[in-house]
């Protein structure tokens, strides 16, 4: 009843592949940061496994992750965000595998939102705008955005545009007339912080006008 794994458990554990990946989200809930980790092998038996982070923390030397189904996470203000932390998979007191990680290099931004497209008849173009919660943040403020759009019938033929602002102009002549388009956007850290692409924003759908159509604002479908 001591909370330590039995020897047999450890021997079995050592046969498994405990490689894992993590991402951080800074100021994801007010001033709280989060750290999320998961095993790369979805079939790993996680029954008695825990994640622990030590180092580059304020107030405590180590913190235990909370388990929620297949993922492990921490939400706290106590990441120092300077230097590397040691993240370990543990069975009781025994570490099965560890990684030294600087949490500022595994940042996954929050997904952009409020994506919309407005057609400007006089200019013969489409103004794409979206919002990001990172404009209000203290840390991860500078992002690179990836706007992807496609004609709805072209399932895998996405056109990508990278930009640092939250506004993009698409020329009407570059798009097919009288066609339905899907557009979406994601973000990645672009200054000091490093990491991963955010999730995609919800898609926005718009129709291009006929060649001689004088319609105004593009309505979402």
């Amino acid at each position: 009843e001591s909370g330590y794994a039995q020897n047999g458990d450890l021997e079995d554990a050592e046969l498994d592949d405990y490689s894992f990946s993590c991402y951080s989200q800074l100021e994801v809930n007010g001033s709280q940061h989060s750290l999320t980790c998961a095993f790369e092998d979805p079939d790993v038996n996680i029954t008695n496994l825990e994640f622990e982070i030590c180092g580059a923390l304020v107030e405590v030397k180590c913190l235990n992750f909370r388990k929620l189904q297949e993922i492990y996470f921490i939400e706290t203000k106590k990441f120092l965000l300077i230097g590397k932390s040691n993240i370990c998979v543990k069975v009781g007191e025994k570490s099965l595998t560890c990684k030294k990680i600087d949490l500022t290099t595994i940042v996954k931004p929050e997904a952009p939102f409020d994506l919309s497209v407005v057609y400007r008849e006089g200019a013969n173009d489409f103004v794409v705008t979206f919002n990001t919660s990172h404009l209000q943040k203290k840390y991860v403020k500078v992002l690179m955005h990836d706007v992807a759009y496609r004609q709805e019938k072209d399932e895998n033929k996405w056109t990508h545009v990278n930009l640092s602002s939250t506004k993009l102009t698409l020329l009407q002549r570059k798009l097919q007339p009288a066609a339905m388009y899907e557009i979406k956007v994601r973000s990645i850290p672009d200054h000091y912080f490093k990491g991963f692409w955010s999730e995609w924003s919800p898609s926005y759908y718009f129709r291009t006008p006929e060649i001689n159509n004088s319609s105004g604002e593009m309505d979402p479908i």
Epitope: G3, Y4, E50, V58, E59, V60, C62, N64, R66, G92
Partner: antibody
Framework: QVQLVESGGGLVKPGGSLRLSCAVS????????MAWIRQAPGKGLEWVST????????YYPDSVKGRFTISRDNAKNSLYLQMNSLRAEDTAVYYC???????????????WGQGTLVTVSS | DIQMTQSPSSLSASVGDRVTITCRTS??????LAWYQQKPGKAPKLLLY???TLHIGVPSRFSGSGSGTDYTLTISSLQPEDFATYFC?????????FGGGTKVEIK
Amino acid sequence: QVQLVESGGGLVKPGGSLRLSCAVSGFTLSDYYMAWIRQAPGKGLEWVSTISASGLRTYYPDSVKGRFTISRDNAKNSLYLQMNSLRAEDTAVYYCARPLSAHYGFNYFDYWGQGTLVTVSS
Amino acid sequence: DIQMTQSPSSLSASVGDRVTITCRTSEDIYQGLAWYQQKPGKAPKLLLYSANTLHIGVPSRFSGSGSGTDYTLTISSLQPEDFATYFCQQYYDYPLAFGGGTKVEIK
């Protein structure tokens, strides 16, 4: 409201054993690390043991390591301390305590039981 | 293990006095420090954590400061109900440790 009620204390001879229980209510036990802290008569506070929220990790000071075992039964809303090979210096009021913060292991305690007295004497 | 040195072990003061209690640790605890108040026959009560964060419901006359290895609890204007014993506690690392306590008595 949050309540922690210890029981199981009493008089025991040196070398004997005792099992303390702490019945909790008013919060989800499985969300919290839990701890036992003791106070010898007229003395200061001494941390005795901590168990992680999952129950998979346990922590002890050298003074009780190998003699005391902390455990929990989240389904029964109970925390336990099994004390073996008791010594005169283990005489104290034993408190169970809950940290303010759930889940991660910030061990400062905002809820304490009323304490149960353990006396080790021949 | 982190050692805790709390001083003074006791002090006499009057209502309205400003009282300061110090806690020194043997190594940097990165503000992983809590303060408790205990009255005879009762369990301790949490006053502050994170070295300087007042626990909910605790009067604002209590304050905490410090970093590294040196920490202070201050009672700006001592009230009759503040006569008690005060303990500091480090929670930066295991084993958790408490200071020896400071008994605040009526002068």
